[in-house]
Interface confidence: low
C-alpha cells in the first residue's frame, strides 16, 4: 500500500468529452514533479505529448515529490502505474464505450503539498499561492 | 535554441535597490524552474534564489532572504530579481539559469554586472 | 551547508592525456540512489556550462570524453583525451539541499 502522505488524487479521465480524453492538465503536475529523479529524456517525451493534448488556459497545480527516500521512490511508481492505468481505461474507453467508474479512474487521498522546487522544503524555502 | 538574456546590471550605492530581468526563448518557459546564480569578482559562484516553474514557490540562501525576490512573468517569458538593501558583497556578474526539474540547472545567460560601491 | 571541496585548485595536462578534478562535499549529496551533485564547463569571458548532471549523466551535445562519477560524498569529473578547447575553470555544485554550493573551482591548463 502507499503511505498516507504518498497517495496522490491523479484524475485520469475527462468526463465532459465524448469518447473520454486524458486529463492532461491533472496528469501534467505530477510528470513535472517526479521528473527530476526520472529519466531526463523518457518524462520530458511524456510531457511534451501531455502538453499538446491539454486545452491552453487549463489551469495546472504544482506538486511535489516527497522528501523522504523512501516515499519518493513510492511517489514515483505510483505515479507511472497510476499513469499505465490511465492509459489503459482509454483505449478501454476507446474500444468499447465509457464504463461507469473509469471516467473518474482515481486513487483517493490528497494531493501533495510540498512545494515543486527542492528536496528538503522545510528548509529554507518559503511558498505563496497565487489562485 | 534556448536564450537567456539578462539586462538591469548597474552602479549602485550600498543601501539602493536594483532589478534585473532575463528575457527567455527557445523553449516552454512555463514548464521550468529558473533560478538567479552571480559570480563574484574572485570567480567563486554562488546560488541567489530559485522559482518554481509556476511562481508559486520562491528559495533564497539565508544571506539573500529578505533583501531579494525572484518573480516571474509567464505570459512575457521573463524573469526577474528585485534586489534591494544592497551591500558591496553583492558586486557579482549575476546569472539568469534555467532550471531542470528542482536539481540541475542546465543553460545560462551571459550575465549582467551589478557593481556596489559609494 | 554543504562544503564542496574541489582539488586539485588548477592542473596541467598533456594533450591527449587524462585530467581528473576532485570534489568532495561535506555530506552526502546523494538522494534517491542519485547523486545530485553537477559539473559544469566555463571558459574566459563566459557563462558556465553544464557538462554532467546528476553526478554520471552527460548532458546533451557535450563529448564524450567527458564522464563523471561518485556518490555520497566524493565525485569526480575525468576527461580523457584531453583537448586543447577543453582549456577552463571547472566547478562542481550540489543540490541535495538548500542552499545550492559550488566548489571554488578547478583551472585545466593544457600543455
Known amino acids: 500500500m502507499v503511505p498516507e502522505s504518498n497517495r496522490t488524487l491523479l484524475l485520469c479521465l475527462t468526463s465532459d468529452s465524448q469518447p473520454p480524453r486524458l486529463n492532461s492538465s491533472a496528469i501534467l503536475p505530477y510528470f513535472r514533479a517526479i521528473r527530476p529523479l526520472s529519466d531526463k529524456n523518457i518524462i520530458d517525451k511524456i510531457i511534451e505529448q501531455l502538453d499538446k493534448l491539454k486545452f491552453q488556459h487549463e489551469p495546472e497545480t504544482e506538486i511535489s515529490v516527497p522528501a523522504d527516500t523512501f516515499e519518493c521512490k513510492s511517489f514515483i511508481l505510483t505515479i507511472l502505474q497510476q499513469f499505465s492505468a490511465c492509459l489503459e481505461s482509454v483505449f478501454k474507453s476507446l474500444n468499447s464505450g465509457p464504463q461507469k467508474g473509469e471516467l473518474n479512474s482515481k486513487l483517493e487521498g490528497k494531493p501533495i503539498p510540498n512545494p515543486l522546487l527542492g528536496l528538503d522544503s522545510t528548509r529554507t524555502g518559503h511558498h505563496h499561492h497565487h489562485h | 535554441e534556448v536564450q537567456l538574456v539578462e539586462s538591469g546590471g548597474d552602479l549602485v550605492k550600498p543601501g539602493g535597490s536594483l532589478k534585473l530581468s532575463c528575457a527567455a526563448s527557445?523553449?516552454?518557459?512555463?514548464?521550468?524552474?529558473m533560478s538567479w546564480v552571480r559570480q563574484t569578482p574572485d570567480k567563486r559562484l554562488e546560488w541567489v534564489a530559485t522559482?518554481?516553474?509556476?511562481?508559486?514557490?520562491?528559495y533564497y540562501p539565508d544571506n539573500i532572504k529578505g533583501r531579494f525576490t525572484i518573480s516571474r512573468d509567464n505570459a512575457k517569458n521573463t524573469l526577474y530579481l528585485q534586489m534591494s538593501s544592497l551591500k558591496s558583497e553583492d558586486t557579482a556578474m549575476y546569472y539568469c539559469?534555467?532550471?531542470?526539474?528542482?536539481?540541475?540547472?542546465?543553460?545560462w545567460g551571459q550575465g549582467t554586472s551589478v557593481t556596489v560601491s559609494s | 551547508d554543504i562544503l564542496l571541496t574541489q582539488s586539485p585548485a588548477s592542473l596541467a595536462v598533456s594533450l591527449g592525456q587524462r585530467a581528473i578534478i576532485s570534489c568532495k562535499a561535506s555530506?552526502?549529496?546523494?538522494?534517491?540512489?542519485?547523486?545530485?551533485m553537477h559539473w559544469y564547463q566555463q571558459k574566459p569571458g563566459q557563462q558556465p556550462k553544464l557538462l554532467i548532471y546528476?553526478?554520471?549523466n552527460l548532458e546533451a551535445g557535450v563529448p564524450t570524453r567527458f564522464s563523471g562519477s561518485g556518490s555520497r560524498t566524493d565525485f569526480t569529473l575525468n576527461i580523457h583525451p584531453v583537448e586543447e578547447e577543453d582549456a577552463a575553470t571547472y566547478f562542481c555544485?550540489?543540490?541535495?539541499?538548500?542552499?545550492?554550493?559550488f566548489g571554488g573551482g578547478t583551472k585545466l591548463e593544457i600543455k
Open positions: 539559469v534555467r532550471g531542470y526539474g528542482y536539481d540541475t540547472m542546465d543553460y
Open positions: 527557445g523553449f516552454s518557459f512555463s514548464n521550468y524552474g
Open positions: 522559482i518554481s516553474y509556476g511562481g508559486s514557490y520562491t
Open positions: 555530506q552526502s549529496v546523494s538522494f534517491a540512489g542519485t547523486g545530485l
Open positions: 546528476r553526478a554520471s
Open positions: 555544485q550540489q543540490s541535495r539541499e538548500y542552499p545550492w554550493t
